[in-house]
């Protein structure tokens, strides 16, 4: 059974992940971002189901495509360069989903834009955090 300290750690990690994803979304939606139209042409895979921490496997697999899209954006929109930002997110995701997970990601048939993708995972983080508090 999860202890209060492990629950608190999970909550903090999810909050960190949430902030990173929100920062990316804000950077992309910045009205000064001239690359937004181009960025919206990239397609992302969405999870069929995202209700548990193990489902973060689906986010992990899309981090490299996310980095490639962020490389198009103006670097001043983000505090970190895309490679470092994604690496930080990857570390959190690996810890949250657990290295021993046997879950294989299943994706929805429809792909999504980067904005829809980020919003989906932001909602996921918010949902899990609300169950922990």
């Amino acid at each position: 059974a999860p202890t209060s300290s492990s629950t608190k750690k999970t909550q903090l990690q999810l909050e960190h992940l949430l902030l990173d994803l929100q920062m990316i979304l804000n950077g992309i939606n910045n009205y000064k971002n001239p690359k937004l139209t181009r960025m919206l042409t990239f397609k992302f895979y969405m999870p069929k189901k995202a209700t548990e921490l193990k489902h973060l496997q689906c986010l992990e697999e899309e981090l490299k495509p996310l980095e490639e899209v962020l490389n198009l954006a103006q670097s001043k929109n983000f505090h970190l360069r895309p490679r470092d930002l994604i690496s930080n997110i990857n570390v959190i995701v690996l810890e949250l989903k657990g290295s021993e997970t046997t879950f294989m990601c299943e994706y929805a048939d429809e792909t999504a834009t980067i904005v829809e993708f980020l919003n989906r995972w932001i909602t996921f983080c918010q949902s899990i955090i609300s169950t922990l508090t």
């Epitope: 689906c58 697999e61 899309e62 981090l63 490679r83 879950f103 294989m104 990601c105 299943e106």
Partner: antibody, heavy 119, light 107 residues
Framework: EVQLLESGGGLVQPGGSLRLSCAAS????????MSWVRQAPGKGLEWVST????????YYADSVKGRFTISRDNSKNTLYLQMNSLRAEDTAVYYC????????????WGQGTLVTVSS | DIQMTQSPSSLSASVGDRVTITCRAS??????LNWYQQKPGKAPKLLIY???SLQSGVPSRFSGSGSGTDFTLTISSLQPEDFATYYC?????????FGQGTKVEIK
């Protein structure tokens, strides 16, 4: 024990095709990105291709793009490399390797399988 | 593409020597640098990842340092089993690229 075992190498004529396989054991195959790395005789290492854990994302070196196809069958714990329109410069030992995450370090390697393209 | 240049391409050393191999990237790759050891007829083996992290099971005589464009692999006291070829590899961006290798031979 974590293990990768390649097979399918051999002699093929220029323009021919070959399919390499890599059988994985000792770890949860579907949660790891997997790659192929090659080494021409007496030369250094060259990254060829990477595939995500579920198989939906694939990445290729420019030198093989359009000719090689990476795929995986997670139910069989097997990674594949379909090589078409082979050229003499594709002659190499092909290694399959596990990545800690996509574009992470290659932490587990197979023993390699030799592909020779010659007429 | 990011070019990785190793030096020297080969070196001769004795058991017990301190050996240093350098790797230079053509652009800033932060600490996304890995080192591998390869013996003749064998697959490469991961020694160091993220520039300075020692891979599990690798002897502590191996160490890595550096960030940005300049990196170093050090073997503090060369052992008989360390005679091999060493490769650096960047995992900063695609295509993933390796150095040309440094062959460590017995003096």
């Amino acid at each position: 024990e974590v293990q990768l075992l390649e097979s399918g190498g051999g002699l093929v004529q220029p323009g021919g095709s070959l399919r390499l396989s890599c059988a994985a054991s000792g770890f949860t195959f579907s949660t790891y990105a997997m790659s192929w790395v090659r080494q021409a005789p007496g030369k250094g290492l060259e990254w060829v291709s990477t595939i995500s854990g579920s198989g939906v994302r694939t990445y290729y070196a420019d030198s093989v793009k359009g000719r090689f196809t990476i795929s995986r069958d997670n139910s069989k714990n097997t990674l594949y490399l379909q090589m078409n329109s082979l050229r003499a410069e594709d002659t190499a030992v092909y290694y399959c390797a596990r990545e800690t995450y996509i574009y992470g370090p290659f932490d587990v390697w197979g023993q390699g399988t030799l592909v020779t393209v010659s007429s | 593409d990011i070019q990785m240049t190793q030096s020297p391409s080969s070196l001769s050393a004795s058991v017990g020597d301190r050996v240093t191999i350098t790797c230079r990237a053509s652009q800033d790759i932060s600490t996304y640098l890995n080192w591998y050891q390869q013996k003749p007829g064998k697959a490469p083996k991961l020694l160091i990842y993220d520039a300075s992290s020692l891979q599990s099971g690798v002897p502590s005589r191996f160490s890595g340092s550096g960030s940005g464009t300049d990196f170093t692999l050090t073997i503090s006291s060369l052992q008989p089993e360390d005679f091999a070829t060493y490769y650096c590899q960047q995992s900063y961006s695609a295509p993933l690229t390796f150095g040309q290798g440094t062959k460590v031979e017995i003096k």
